[in-house]
Structures are given as structure tokens and as C-alpha cells.
């Protein structure tokens, strides 16, 4: 990773764009900590492994989180 992580936050910009859950490889939610004062959501896409920072305050992103957790709860026994 090019930037040293002595701080630091991961996201330089954030996106409101909803992501299709089917195109998601992984969704990480990083809670606020001493390293970064804000919650960060990082979506890793199946296509090319693109990583995109999502806006935790966006309605569309909140809906995505709900959809993903619903999907996970369906899968788990």
C-alpha cells in the first residue's frame, strides 16, 4: 500500500453510488478508531478487484448494508 498507515484513514473520497450486491466481492466496515475518527465502508468489486469507499451516511448505502446483511443471514444456518 503506497501510503503509510500511521494515521490513517483509508478513504480519500466517498461515493453515494449504490453498488449491486451481486457485483460485490467483499464489503468491509471499519469502525472509527484512534487511527481514523470516522466509520469507513470499503466495497471490493468482483470486476478487476476495484475497491471503492462508500458514504456511510447515504440512504442508498444504508440500504445496501441491509441487503447484504439479510443475504448473509439467509446463508448462515
Amino acid at each position: 500500500v503506497p501510503l503509510s498507515r500511521t494515521v490513517r484513514c483509508t478513504c480519500i473520497s466517498i461515493s453515494n453510488q449504490p453498488v449491486n450486491p451481486r457485483s460485490l466481492e467483499k464489503l468491509e466496515i471499519i469502525p472509527a478508531s484512534q487511527f481514523c475518527p470516522r466509520v469507513e465502508i470499503i466495497a471490493t468489486m468482483k470486476k478487476k478487484g476495484e475497491k471503492r469507499c462508500l458514504n456511510p451516511e447515504s440512504k442508498a448505502i444504508k440500504n445496501l448494508l441491509k441487503a447484504v446483511s439479510k443475504e448473509r443471514s439467509k446463508r448462515s444456518p
Partner: antibody
Framework: QVQLVESGGGVVQPGRSLRLSCTAS????????MHWVRQAPGKGLEWVAV????????YYADSVKGRFTISRDNSKNTLYLQMNSLRAEDTAVYYC?????????????????WGQGTTVTVSS | EIVLTQSPGTLSLSPGERATLSCRAS???????LAWYQQKPGQAPRLLIY???SRATGIPDRFSGSGSGTDFTLTISRLEPEDFAVYYC??????????FGPGTKVDIK
């Protein structure tokens, strides 16, 4: 429409200070990282500094470290570059540029919106 | 510090021809961190390609990017009159954080 407008350039003597501003419109400024990039007369592009959307991450080119400070005021949709101890080699057109949507330290989406630039001339 | 070298320095071609621009890094660069820009005289740069091969919004499909490791290429399949400009590659990496190549000028033969 999406727009960045730089201001504050001018002619200044070596050793003096100048503050550049970049006013954003047409997008949610508080969600985007922002850069300053400069271009000396007849030369290529040189990256100067970056600040993340919330101001938590700030990085500088070695050539300006300790002399220039990048900052932002999200309530005013404005990016700043405070330039101290100016040198003749700082003479350039200074552009502000927006970092791509969702960009992060693992994946770089490029600088997708640029202003038209403001000219800084350092001369005695 | 990673240094980017672009070749050729100047490319003289006619409209309709194919342009192949090279960007070479002094050490390996992740394709996630490579971008290409176009700049016309008196204008600000314009983002063409990010992630080595993804076209930016509104960029015509005659522009394509490829490559990995230390060798990257920008291809313009058929030059249009408005494509004559200077092209810069750029990488995002360790200090200095963002580095531009010296540019390739594409001019009319």
C-alpha cells in the same frame, strides 16, 4: 455543472507568501479528496499536495514539504493552498483537481475534474 | 522513488492513424494506481484512463489503456483532429505520492 475555480495567483517576491483558493460547485465537495497540481511554463505536470474529503489525510510533494499547507473548508466548498517561503522555482500555473469518487489508498480513480488554473509568478 | 518515463517524446501522425504511447516505471506499479491524462495547449488536463485500463466517464472508446508491472500503454485506435495534444501517465505510490511522466506530444504529421 461541476466546476472548480482557482483564485489568488499573482506576482510575489521570493521569500514571501501567497494563499490560493479553489471554489467548487455542482457537486458535494465534502465527499471528495482534492489536489493541487502545478505546471511551470513550458514544462510538464507536477503534483503538489492532496487532502482527503474529511481533511484527515494530507500529503505533500518533497519539493513543497514544510513550506506549503493544504486545507479545506467544507462549509464554504473551498480548498486552499497556503504557500510560504516562495522560490523562483514555484513559478507555475496552479490547478486544483478533484480525486475520483470512492478513491482510497488501495485503488486510485484519478483526478477527474480540474479547474482552469491560476498563475503564480515568483520574481524579484 | 518511482520514476515514469514516456516514449516517444513526440509522435507525428495523421488523422485516422493509430497512436501507441508508452509509459515505463522504474519499478513495478500496481495497475490499480496508474492513470492517463490528455492536455491541450492553454487548457487543464483531462482524465482519460484510471486503473491502467478503465475509461473515465465520457471518454470515447477509441482510447484504451493496457499493461502491468513496469510497462503501460495508451492506444488511440483512430486519431481524430481533436486528439492532437500532450498525454501524461501518472502513478500513485510512495513518496512522492503522485508522480507524472514527462509527457508525449502527439502532433499532426
Amino acid at each position: 455543472q461541476v466546476q472548480l475555480v482557482e483564485s489568488g495567483g499573482g506576482v510575489v517576491q521570493p521569500g514571501r507568501s501567497l494563499r490560493l483558493s479553489c471554489t467548487a460547485s455542482g457537486f458535494t465537495f465534502s465527499q471528495y479528496g482534492m489536489h493541487w497540481v502545478r505546471q511551470a511554463p513550458g514544462k510538464g505536470l507536477e503534483w503538489v499536495a492532496v487532502i482527503s474529503y474529511g481533511g484527515d489525510i494530507k500529503y505533500y510533494a518533497d519539493s513543497v514539504k514544510g513550506r506549503f499547507t493544504i486545507s479545506r473548508d467544507n462549509s464554504k466548498n473551498t480548498l486552499y493552498l497556503q504557500m510560504n517561503s516562495l522560490r523562483a522555482e514555484d513559478t507555475a500555473v496552479y490547478y486544483c483537481a478533484r480525486e475520483g469518487e470512492g478513491s482510497n489508498i488501495y485503488y486510485y480513480y484519478g483526478m477527474d475534474v480540474w479547474g482552469q488554473g491560476t498563475t503564480v509568478t515568483v520574481s524579484s | 522513488e518511482i520514476v515514469l518515463t514516456q516514449s516517444p517524446g513526440t509522435l507525428s501522425l495523421s488523422p485516422g492513424e493509430r497512436a501507441t504511447l508508452s509509459c515505463r516505471a522504474s519499478q513495478s506499479v500496481s495497475s490499480s494506481y496508474l492513470a492517463w491524462y490528455q492536455q491541450k495547449p492553454g487548457q487543464a488536463p483531462r482524465l482519460l484512463i484510471y486503473g491502467a485500463s478503465s475509461r473515465a466517464t465520457g471518454i470515447p472508446d477509441r482510447f484504451s489503456g493496457s499493461g502491468s508491472g513496469t510497462d503501460f500503454t495508451l492506444t488511440i485506435s483512430r486519431l481524430e483532429p481533436e486528439d492532437f495534444a500532450v498525454y501524461y501517465c501518472q502513478q500513485y505510490g510512495s513518496s512522492p505520492i503522485f508522480t507524472f511522466g514527462p509527457g508525449t506530444k502527439v502532433d499532426i504529421k
